[in-house]
């Protein structure tokens, strides 16, 4: 494959988290500033995925501000939209319930729980804070709703309200008809590339999502955000973003898409159906 | 009944190399992510590392980072730790210990002796 | 790393009284996910060590009740309501909710 054949690859793996974002500025780091007031003000954690409080120095800083947690809601967070993620009669797990626990390449060491395959079970682990994969949840709870099977056998889904995508109605979850197509791309790919805080010169790739492509920067070593890849293959196969179509027996079919050839027109970070 | 079992300690010079076995029985073995423990002569206990399920992934002890190296076969219910530059403050004994649901060590080998000295 | 600090270091006990060995953290052991990652380990005389309790108070399989684990935040107790000769060797409080695992320096149980 060409570069340019490469760069427009639809992507359908699953295993790092949907893009949950409504705008790219709710992936920006928290910044202060460089002002010494003390002023109270939120800010939304794509780690944790909640809006939280931080202190902001009173001049510059990003977009990733808002003057109340319920402005910050409202702008990143999306209570009040439904995610468009698979719902089938008889669910599957989702493929990322099969993987590996993944620490990842970071040591701020966290507790987060995965499906254990062999067990059945979700088990607890600890998490480097960065990179990783998606059999990696917050909760517990979370973890048995999305990858344990229910008392009948069947998946227990908490993946919310799914669309009908012959007529863009939503349809209930007791739905037999599957939604067409699945959106599935990470939000810290929207993150800019971040050094870090240490003095090594380390070669990385970050994704670029003003111009859609990977792009190569120097990692200090420490620190930085998880829009880093150790590979230009690792980092498109993360951040391109990709559709799954889903035909009506639960199967996958991986599209491959070229530039001159687009068949689907769908906007990258507004993927979500509005509550009726 | 869950078993595992030590072997490969013994004396080497610093600076050299060891590799340890533990060999498990009794139990799913690539259900569970795997430690190595070790214990100085008359001290207390030392975590030395962590291996995950699969073997794809471990964790280190800053003590022994880039220094050993931990590795499982799943196949052969095998569980290793190679020690390379070992130092004289590595002679212990080294136990491996299986990891639960909670990521809490349960059940530990009889341990086996590696010491290190010219 | 957080630092396990258990006293005393050693405990001489007559036959069928009780025992109580303590372990402090230098930092809370409560999880985010609200539990207690604080642990006893039992090692006899030249034998290798075996769980005794987990998640503060639980019991392993096939220890006895006499033994009982309380405590939370950053102090932790074991009990031992009537100490048996089995019961002679070191005792090992250890934290799994921070990482790296720590294990405190082992309190020496022995009769009097």
């Known amino acids: 494959d060409s570069e340019e054949d490469e760069e427009h690859t639809i992507i359908t793996d699953t295993e790092l988290p949907p893009l949950k974002l409504m705008h790219s500025f709710c992936a920006f780091k928290a910044d202060d500033g460089p002002c010494k007031a003390i002023m109270k003000r939120f800010f939304f954690n794509i780690f944790t995925r909640q809006c939280e409080e931080f202190i902001y120095g009173g001049c510059e800083g990003n977009q990733n501000r808002f003057e109340s947690l319920e402005e910050c809601k409202k702008m990143c967070t999306r209570d009040n939209a439904n995610r468009i993620i698979k719902t089938t009669l008889q669910q599957e797990k989702p493929d990322f319930c099969f993987l590996e626990e993944d620490p990842g390449i970071c040591r701020g060491y966290i507790t987060r729980y995965f499906y254990n395959n062999q067990t059945k079970q979700c088990e607890r682990f600890k998490y480097g804070g960065c990179l990783g994969n998606m059999n990696n949840f917050e909760t517990l709870e979370e973890c048995k709703n999305i990858c344990e099977d229910g008392p009948n056998g069947f998946q227990v889904d908490n993946y919310g309200t799914q669309l009908n995508a012959v007529n863009n109605s939503l349809t209930p979850q007791s739905t037999k008809v599957p939604s067409l197509f699945e959106f599935h791309g990470p939000s810290w790919c929207l993150t800019p590339a971040d050094r870090g805080l240490c003095r090594a010169n380390e070669n990385r790739f970050y994704y670029n999502s003003v111009i859609g492509k990977c792009r190569p920067f120097k990692y200090s070593g420490c620190g930085g955000n998880e829009n880093n890849f150790t590979s230009k293959q690792e980092c498109l196969r993360a951040c391109k973003k990709g559709f799954i179509q889903r035909i009506s027996k639960g199967g996958l079919i991986k599209t491959k898409r070229k530039r001159k050839k687009q068949r689907v027109k769908i906007a990258y970070e507004e993927i979500f159906v509005k509550n009726m | 009944e869950v078993q595992l079992v030590e072997s490969g300690g013994g004396l080497v010079k610093p600076g050299g190399s060891l590799r340890l076995s533990c060999a498990a029985s009794?139990?799913?073995?690539?259900?569970?992510?795997m430690n190595w423990v070790r214990q100085a002569p008359g001290k207390g206990l030392e975590w030395v590392g962590t291996?995950?399920?699969?073997?794809?992934?471990?964790y280190y002890a800053d003590s022994v980072q880039g220094r050993f190296t931990i590795s499982r076969d799943n196949a052969k219910n095998s569980l290793y730790l190679q020690m390379n530059s070992l130092r004289a403050e590595d002679t212990a004994v080294y136990y491996c210990?299986?990891?639960?649901?909670?990521?809490?060590?349960?059940?530990w080998g009889q341990g086996t002796l590696v010491t290190v000295s010219s | 790393d957080v630092v396990m600090t258990q006293t005393p270091l050693s405990l001489p006990v007559t036959l069928g009284q009780p025992a109580s060995i303590s372990c402090k953290s230098s930092?809370?052991?409560?999880?985010?996910?609200?539990?207690?990652?604080l642990n006893w380990l039992q090692q006899r005389p030249g034998q290798s060590p075996k769980r005794l309790i987990y998640?503060?108070?639980k019991l392993d399989s096939g220890v006895p009740d006499r033994f009982t684990g309380s405590g939370s935040g950053t102090d932790f107790t074991l009990k031992i309501s009537r100490v048996e000769a089995e019961d002679v060797g070191v005792y090992y409080c250890?934290?799994?909710?921070?990482?790296?695992?720590?294990f405190g320096q082992g309190t020496k149980v022995e009769i009097k």
């Open positions: 210990a299986r990891q639960d649901g909670n990521f809490l060590m349960d059940y």
């Open positions: 009794g139990f799913t073995f690539s259900s569970y992510a």
């Open positions: 291996i995950t399920t699969g073997g794809s992934y471990t």
């Open positions: 930092q809370s052991l409560l999880d985010v996910d609200g539990k207690t990652y």
């Open positions: 998640l503060v108070s």
């Open positions: 250890w934290q799994g909710t921070h990482f790296p695992f720590t």
